[in-house]
């Protein structure tokens, strides 16, 4: 007839697929059986494995990152209980909508995490790489996504997201984008035979550059650009009477936003 | 030697109550878990509730068939388990056994005990 | 509560020949399976557990294979002491169930 065991917990670790448990058994020999199970797994025994005289041990690879695992050693009808759970996952892939962007809106989207998952936490950081906005949304099968609102146009951002399971939180996994800067304002035209003054207001937000185009049915005629604190722009050698596609773009961030207006020379 | 003996089964009108008694020897009864199964003439396994150690406060598990008419207990002093049957019901005529079951060495391990019948008829 | 369907319901083999059972759970159990052997007039009598581990005296002639909801209890080579009524029962949740049962016969 096996006695009953006296057992302690030596050491319990846990990454995204793997557990470890070691524990010691207390005074003569004895018979236990390790047992653990999940909410979906059902029970099964843990190989264990002698570490020496007193201390037993179990490693189990291949698990459900984010998942909660019980684990039993048993003796007879004694037992302790150790509750261990598997970090989670960040999503594979996380990105920025780029067709979605606005002046003053990012959206991000992301894949589901492989294991449980609770919730996600998405935050926006500056260029800076101070905190903006963060945001916990819950998971969902169907609804893997975020709009961020009231953004700075023109700017660089980076968005972290990290999956939460229980009270475990895995590593970030960061993308970045960029709000599309502002067009300009107030496009004003001074006109001359020769010559066009162009003169305009800034938008909102950020402009690293304005660039100045005068087009002629498609084709770049005549171009410039200027820094972020100019506001006028004068085109010289013009043909006079004749009609031209102005188009004032403003660049930041890597993408752009322009206003277009047609003009016409002054005639002789 | 592992024994279960069971005793008490016997002919009881439906809406009466019997109670089973097991005598367990031959193992560290207060260390282990133990269970009623029972099986009706000719049919198969019924698995009918269970009952654990006192370090486990004595905690019990039913079968939803018997939920709420059974009660098991147990008196580790005299090494012995209970089956209490009230409102007793003709689909309770049955063989009712007596069953520990332990976990050690990686096993899980039931011992049976022959099995007192018992007959619910009017 | 878990549901154990064992299949077939009966099953006749010559002597000398394979006879396998299988048990099917209606949710995961992990491995937390248990065979047994009955015959007439008699308690039954464990024969596997942990899905695949024989009990001390079990010949080897059985086996048992099988995890999560899938168990199958093999005889390899069928003698005549085996004809009995086996039954799967899982003990991974309460309430612990038995599947309702396989009579095994000699063709």
């Known amino acids: 007839e096996p006695e009953r065991c006296n057992f302690t917990l030596a050491e319990s670790k846990a990454s995204s697929h793997s557990v470890s448990i070691q524990w010691r058994i207390l005074g003569s020999p004895c018979n236990f059986s390790l047992i653990y199970s999940s909410d979906t797994l059902g029970a099964a025994l843990c190989p264990t494995f002698r570490i020496d005289n007193t201390t037993y041990g179990c490693n189990l690879q291949d698990l459900q990152a984010g998942t909660i695992y019980n684990f039993r050693i048993i003796s007879l009808d004694e037992e302790r209980t150790v509750v261990l759970q598997t970090d989670p996952l960040p999503p594979a892939r996380f990105g920025v909508s780029k067709e979605k962007t606005t002046s003053t809106s990012l959206h991000v989207w992301w894949t589901p995490s492989s294991g449980k998952v609770t919730s996600y936490e998405v935050q926006l950081f500056d260029e800076n790489n101070q905190k903006i906005q963060g945001v916990q949304i819950q998971e969902s099968t169907s609804w893997n996504e975020y709009t961020f609102f009231n953004l700075t146009a023109g700017s660089k951002y980076n968005i972290a997201i990290t999956a939460v399971s229980g009270g475990k939180r895995s590593f970030s996994v960061y993308t970045n984008g960029s709000t599309v800067p502002s067009p300009v304002k107030d496009i004003g035209i001074s006109t001359k035979a020769n010559s066009l003054l162009i003169s305009w207001s800034h938008g909102s937000g950020n402009v690293e550059r304005y660039r100045l185009m005068l087009m002629d049915k498609g084709i770049l005629v005549h171009g410039g650009v200027v820094d972020k604190h100019a506001t006028s722009y004068a085109f010289h050698g013009l043909t006079p009477g004749y009609l031209y596609n102005l188009t004032v773009m403003t660049e930041a961030a890597g993408l752009q936003n322009y206003r277009w207006k047609l003009v016409r020379t002054a005639p002789m | 030697e592992v024994q279960l003996v069971e005793s008490g089964g016997g002919l009881v009108q439906p809406g009466g109550s019997l109670r089973l008694s097991c005598a367990a020897s031959g193992f560290t009864f207060n260390a282990n878990a133990m269970n009623w199964v029972r099986q009706a003439p000719g049919k198969g396994l019924e698995w009918v509730g269970r009952i654990r150690t006192k370090s486990n406060n004595y905690a019990t598990y039913y079968a939803g068939s018997v939920k709420d008419r059974f009660t098991i207990s147990r008196d580790d002093s005299k090494n012995s388990l209970y089956l209490q049957m009230n409102s007793l019901k003709t689909e309770d005529t049955a063989v009712y056994y007596c069953v520990r079951d332990y976990y050690g060495s990686s096993a899980w391990i039931t011992y049976w005990g022959q099995g007192t019948l018992v007959t619910v008829s009017s | 509560d878990i549901v154990m369907t064992q299949s077939p319901d009966s099953l006749a083999v010559s002597l000398g020949e394979r006879a396998t059972i299988n048990c099917k759970a209606s949710?995961?159990?992990?491995?937390?399976v248990a065979w047994y052997q009955q015959k007439p007039g008699q308690p039954p009598k464990l024969l596997i557990y942990?899905?695949?581990t024989r009990h001390t005296g079990v010949p080897d002639r059985f086996s048992g294979s099988g995890s999560g909801t899938d168990f199958t209890l093999t005889i390899s080579s069928l003698q005549a002491e085996d004809v009995a009524v086996y039954y799967c029962?899982?003990?991974?949740?309460?309430?612990?169930?038995f599947g309702q049962g396989t009579k095994l016969e000699i063709k």
């Open positions: 029962q899982q003990y991974s949740s309460y309430p612990f169930t």
């Open positions: 949710q995961h159990v992990g491995t937390a």
């Open positions: 942990w899905a695949s």
